[in-house]
């Protein structure tokens, strides 16, 4: 047969040769020839390549910069990049997690629907009728109004989304 024009999976075409790609964790040193195999070398410390490749340089592991609120969630290997996450109380600003911002607090009248993680911000929701939040918090949900009836009390002041009801004793004259 004549030299190929297309190659198998995990191969690449160069100078009419189908050469083996380098496996993840290794970089290309020299292309194969009619008489020799592709030559690959392992990536160095703090480097990686995560695919079958013909790269002549490995990629540097991501640096989790503490000055940006980042810390290492998973240490990189020769085949995987380092995964960064944010310090407690902070979350990533993007999917790539290149910097962190402080978790948002839910204002009075709003409660926490979903607590923030290292990669997602706090999700707040307005307190519905029957619930309130009187604090600015990144953790507190909307609390239900106090049930005066269960305490044998009556509502003296109606609750709002920011305040609880105020209960008081029953009016004895109406008894």
């Amino acid at each position: 047969p004549e030299p190929p024009t297309a190659c198998r999976e995990k191969q690449y075409l160069i100078n009419s040769q189908c050469c083996s790609l380098c496996q993840p964790g290794q970089k290309l040193v020299s292309d194969c020839t009619e008489f020799t195999e592709t030559e690959c070398l392992p990536c160095g410390e703090s480097e990686f390549l995560d695919t079958w490749n013909r790269e002549t340089h490995c990629h540097q592991h991501k640096y989790c910069d503490p000055n940006l609120g980042l810390r290492v969630q998973q240490k990189g290997t020769s085949e995987t990049d380092t995964i960064c996450t944010c310090e407690e109380g902070w979350h990533c600003t993007s999917e790539a997690c290149e910097s962190c911002v402080l978790h948002r607090s839910c204002s009075p009248g709003f409660g926490v629907k979903q607590i923030a993680t290292g990669v997602s911000d706090t999700i707040c929701e307005p307190c519905p009728v029957g619930f309130f939040s009187n604090v600015s918090s990144a953790f507190e949900k909307c609390h239900p109004w106090t049930s005066c009836e269960t305490k044998d009390l009556v509502v003296q002041q109606a609750g709002t989304n920011k305040t609880d009801v105020v209960c008081g004793p029953q009016d004895r004259l109406r008894a």
Partner: antibody, heavy 112, light 112 residues
Framework: QVQLQESGPGLVKPSETLSLTCTVS?????????WNWIRQPPGKGLEWMGY???????NYNPSLKNRITISRDTSKNQFSLKLSSVTAADTAVYYC?????WGQGTLVTVSS | DAVMTQSPLSLPVTLGEPASISCRSS???????????LNWFQQKPGQSPRLLIY???NRFSGVPDRFSGSGSGTDFTLKISRVEAEDVGVYYC?????????FGQGTKLEIK
């Protein structure tokens, strides 16, 4: 077009060192490939002697024991063969080759 | 070492007829990647060897398609579909899977 050209003395005395140089044009010897020396005694078959790689490392035929050295001069795009303590049995046509391209060969006679 | 044994050593052929040369290795020439580095060369009288086939079955550029190579493991064959007068010469197999590289003894093709 890749071309290889051997040069060196055609006559060497027994026990002396045979020295040949191969000049390569049309391709850098540091880019890729293994650069070989192959010899052929008169009327006989081919014998691989050794190579120097694009990165400067070597491999030799164990049959030549410790007599063989292949080196290179990257500034001149040349690689060289030295074979010490020669005898009449080393009389041969010596080829330098990339294997897909060969020099025309040079006859070296070992005789006093 | 991988010992390469060619047969026949002499091959008289009628012009226009096919010719076949066998090359056997004392060990498998398939490497860990599944590639086999077995080559065929033609050497005409007074000339340097010329690459015909590399990696068992790939024709080198400029080689007529009447030349073909096949085989695997330890058994390999060079075929000429219809011999022409210019095909006269000695044919060598060469393995470069294992160091030292080793040639077969050569097969002399002549016209009957």
């Amino acid at each position: 077009q890749v071309q290889l050209q051997e040069s060196g003395p055609g006559l060497v005395k027994p026990s002396e060192t045979l020295s040949l140089t191969c000049t390569v044009s049309g391709y850098s010897i540091t880019s890729n490939y293994y650069w070989n020396w192959i010899r052929q005694p008169p009327g006989k078959g081919l014998e691989w002697m050794g190579y120097i790689r694009y990165d400067g490392s070597n491999n030799y035929n164990p049959s030549l024991k410790n007599r063989i050295t292949i080196s290179r001069d990257t500034s001149k795009n040349q690689f060289s063969l030295k074979l010490s303590s020669v005898t009449a049995a080393d009389t041969a046509v010596y080829y330098c080759a990339r294997l897909d391209y060969w020099g025309q060969g040079t006859l070296v006679t070992v005789s006093s | 070492d991988a010992v390469m044994t060619q047969s026949p050593l002499s091959l008289p052929v009628t012009l226009g007829e096919p010719a076949s040369i066998s090359c056997r290795s004392s060990q498998s020439l398939e490497n860990t990647n599944g590639n086999t580095f077995l080559n065929w060369f033609q050497q005409k009288p007074g000339q340097s060897p010329r690459l015909l086939i590399y990696r068992v079955s790939n024709r080198f550029s400029g080689v007529p398609d009447r030349f073909s190579g096949s085989g695997s493991g330890t058994d390999f064959t060079l075929k000429i579909s219809r011999v022409e007068a210019e095909d006269v010469g000695v044919y060598y197999c060469l393995q470069v899977t294992h160091v030292p590289f080793t040639f077969g003894q050569g097969t002399k093709l002549e016209i009957k």
